[in-house]
């Protein structure tokens, strides 16, 4: 019985898209066949969910439709990316781990990745 | 105001039911997994039970299991606690508890207190 | 099943003074402890979590510290409010367990 560590990258630049990419890495204590994993976001010590989804081992990684997450899992990893985003969605975004099933329950926090996103200039207007 | 308010305690029997419940307000309660925790007179606190938000997966102490069922109604933002066989070492304040994102019981009821005596 | 150890179970302090309460596990829980403070007859309230991260609203008098096995909750200056039962808890795995408690109470 030990506690589960994960590891996710310091920091992450948006593409100009508004789209972001990082992998979630986690140490499993337990043979899980069940997991949990949720985006964070942390911003004046407030934390919002931004989206989350349960996989079972060996399987794809689903977020509901309407999520602004998708990811794909492979062993201890999920890699995932968030769309959408704005200039003033930049902030720290924390991996959050659950082995749900079977139990025991372990839970799993990463330090957070700060994902800078910076808005497009508009395309400047032309003569021709 | 994020609240939560216990009811159902009282006086019961060895061996006698007794159902609580917790009732959720100020919150969206169906995001977030609920624990009940108890605590004996003068003593420590002790967790029971907790439930995921959607109902999925539920954790028992050793000391319950078997004995308590915990359940949830999203719809109508309460968690209860069914007690069965009831033992005269259940006698306790039990809180319901809201787990927080990262983890810890972050919101608690003001507790209700159950008496398993003959 | 980890077992949390509070040490000692009473500590007496004058309004004012610094008081540091220890918190050791039998086996690592990373950074997954939290600490309440508990009055007679009231509810326990969530001061710190993930070892050192004060909750919404606390003051910033109280602070943790620690990570593995080993850990710590100062208080730096006791208000008089602040006379209370103190628990330490982990939530890094089920069953979740809390320590016995150390009551702060007035010299």
């Known amino acids: 019985c030990k506690a589960m560590h994960v590891a996710q990258p310091a920091v992450v630049l948006a593409s100009s898209r508004g789209i972001a990419s990082f992998v979630c890495e986690y140490a499993s204590p337990g043979k899980a066949t069940e997991v949990r994993v949720t985006v964070l976001r942390q911003a004046d010590s407030q934390v919002t969910e931004v989206c989350a989804a349960t996989y079972m081992m060996g399987n794809e990684l689903t977020f509901l439709d309407d999520s602004i997450c998708t990811g794909t899992s492979s062993g201890n990893q999920v890699n995932l990316t968030i769309q959408g985003l704005r200039a003033m969605d930049t902030g720290l975004y924390i991996c959050k781990v659950e082995l749900m099933y079977p139990p025991p329950y372990y839970l799993g926090i990463g330090n957070g990745t700060q994902i800078y996103v910076i808005d497009p200039e508009p395309c400047p207007d032309s003569d021709f | 105001e994020v609240q939560l308010l216990e009811s159902g305690g009282g006086l019961v029997q060895p061996g006698g039911s007794l159902r609580l419940s917790c009732a959720a307000s100020?919150?969206?309660?169906?995001?977030?997994?609920m624990s009940w925790v108890r605590q004996a007179p003068g003593k420590g606190l002790v967790w029971v039970s907790s439930?995921?938000?959607?109902?999925?997966?539920?954790y028992y102490a050793d000391s319950v299991k078997g004995r308590f069922t915990i359940s949830r109604d999203n719809a109508k933002n309460s968690l209860y606690l069914q007690m069965n066989s009831l033992r005269a070492e259940d006698t306790a304040v039990y809180y319901c508890?809201?787990?927080?994102?990262?983890?810890?019981?972050?919101?608690w009821g003001q507790g209700t207190m159950v008496t398993v005596s003959s | 099943e980890i077992v949390l150890t509070q040490s000692p179970a009473t500590l007496s302090f004058s309004p004012g003074e610094r008081a540091t309460l220890s918190c050791r596990a039998s086996?690592?829980?990373?950074?997954?402890l939290a600490w309440y403070q508990q009055k007679p007859g009231q509810a326990p309230r969530l001061l710190i979590y993930?070892?050192?991260s004060r909750a919404t609203g606390i003051p910033d008098r109280f602070s943790g510290s620690g990570s593995g096995t080993d850990f710590t909750f100062t208080i730096s200056r006791l208000e008089p409010e602040d006379f209370a039962v103190y628990y330490c808890?982990?939530?890094?795995?089920?069953?979740?367990?809390f320590g016995p408690g150390t009551k702060v109470d007035i010299k």
């Open positions: 100020g919150f969206t309660f169906s995001s977030y997994a």
């Open positions: 808890q982990q939530y890094g795995s089920s069953p979740f367990t």
């Open positions: 508890a809201r787990v927080g994102l990262m983890g810890p019981f972050d919101i």
């Open positions: 993930g070892a050192s």
């Open positions: 439930i995921s938000s959607s109902s999925s997966y539920i």
């Open positions: 086996q690592s829980v990373s950074s997954y």
